[in-house]
Interface confidence: low
């Protein structure tokens, strides 16, 4: 999907309003600083792009983000503001359904949603223009 | 434990330059912004400029464009700050202080110790 | 340049009062951030985004306002409390208000 011309303002303030608080939730016992953010994106789209991938596809060691409550609330912004995204989005659901497994809280987990909130910080921050 | 550190009082004549140097430790300093402040004796605080470590990108106030430059050494994580053509004015502390996206808002959650700065002939 | 106007500039209170500080811009800005600083101190963040409360600040303060009219409230002045505070905003680069002292009575 193309994230080009999804409303980012209105992204963002979802993000503020709620999914952030909700990432924090998901960390919450965890030291800031216990993991390097090793993912990184240079414009919105793009941050978008990653934040989608490490959200909903499923990874070695962590195979349960999708039904957070984050994930849902991201799921829901991308809907609203990015035309078209739902429509992409109805057969990679249908696939996660059927391959859902019990909620697991893994170490692998916590560190992939800290790498989601450096993505967020990203994507809230456009960078200052070079001068 | 984020920490900013900054270099030593600096004493320096009208027409010089001063080099504040402010290193960085606890987070990746990548990913926040870093601002300079600062303040002459019994004066408001007063925003310089802000830079982003990620590229470089900079954004001055215009009261100083010009006379000020500011960049980062990444591979050191450490913020520095040049100010030109000094005037007995421009003494001052010179803060450092990284800008996190915590709440609503960019805010300067953590600040260097200051660096003071005298001009005078 | 958004210009921060805090008033007053001095407030002489005695310990167990109410303390109102107040900061308006020049023009509306989203949120307003506030900062305590002592002598000889650099700044420590106090309130972020007009009303949340920065990590350890007692429950006695807090922030409220919209657009160009923000305030700072302790609801009761304890010794530790007198100090410099200063507001700022970055709806337009970075601007901080000239302070408003709060001094023992």
């Known amino acids: 999907y193309d994230f080009t011309n999804c409303d980012f303002e209105k992204i963002k303030a979802a993000y503020l309003s709620t999914i952030s608080k909700d990432l924090i939730t998901y960390m919450s016992g965890t030291k800031s600083t216990e993991f390097n953010n090793t993912v990184s994106c240079s414009n919105r789209p793009h941050c978008l792009t990653e934040i989608q991938s490490l959200t909903f596809n499923p990874t070695a060691g962590c195979a349960s983000l999708a039904k957070e409550m984050f994930a849902m609330k991201t799921k829901a912004a991308l809907a609203i503001w990015c035309p078209g995204y739902s429509e992409t989005q109805i057969n990679a659901t249908q696939a996660m359904k059927k391959r859902r497994k019990r909620k697991v809280t893994t170490n692998k987990c916590l560190e992939q949603v800290s790498q989601l909130q450096g993505l967020w910080r990203r994507f809230n921050r456009p960078l200052l223009k070079q001068q | 434990e984020v920490q900013l550190v900054q270099s030593g009082a600096e004493v320096k004549k009208p027409g010089a330059s001063v080099k504040v140097s402010c290193k960085a430790s606890g987070y990746t300093f990548t990913d926040d912004y870093m601002n300079w402040v600062r303040q002459a004796p019994g004066q408001r605080l007063e925003w310089m400029g802000i830079?982003?470590?990620?590229?470089?990108?900079?954004s001055y106030n215009q009261k100083f464009k010009g006379r000020v430059t500011l960049t980062v050494d990444k591979s050191a994580s450490t913020a520095y700050m040049e100010l030109s053509s000094l005037r007995s004015e421009d003494t001052a502390v010179y803060y450092c202080a990284r800008e996190d996206y915590d709440y609503d808002g960019y805010a300067m959650d953590y600040w260097g110790q200051g660096t003071t700065v005298t001009v005078s002939s | 340049e958004i210009v921060l106007t805090q008033s007053p500039a001095t407030l002489s209170l005695s310990p167990g009062e109410r303390a109102t500080l107040s900061c308006r811009a020049s023009?509306?800005?989203?949120?307003m951030h506030w900062y305590q600083q002592k002598p000889g101190q650099a700044p420590r963040p106090w309130i972020y985004?007009?009303?949340n409360l920065a990590s350890g600040v007692p429950a006695r303060f807090s922030g409220s306002g919209s657009g160009t009219s923000y305030t700072l409230t302790i609801s009761r002045l304890e010794p530790e409390d007198f100090a410099v505070y200063y507001c700022q905003q970055w709806s337009s680069d970075r601007t901080f208000g000239g302070g408003t002292k709060v001094e023992i009575k």
């Open positions: 023009s509306s800005v989203s949120y």
């Open positions: 985004a007009t009303s």
């Open positions: 830079i982003s470590p990620y590229n470089g990108g900079t």
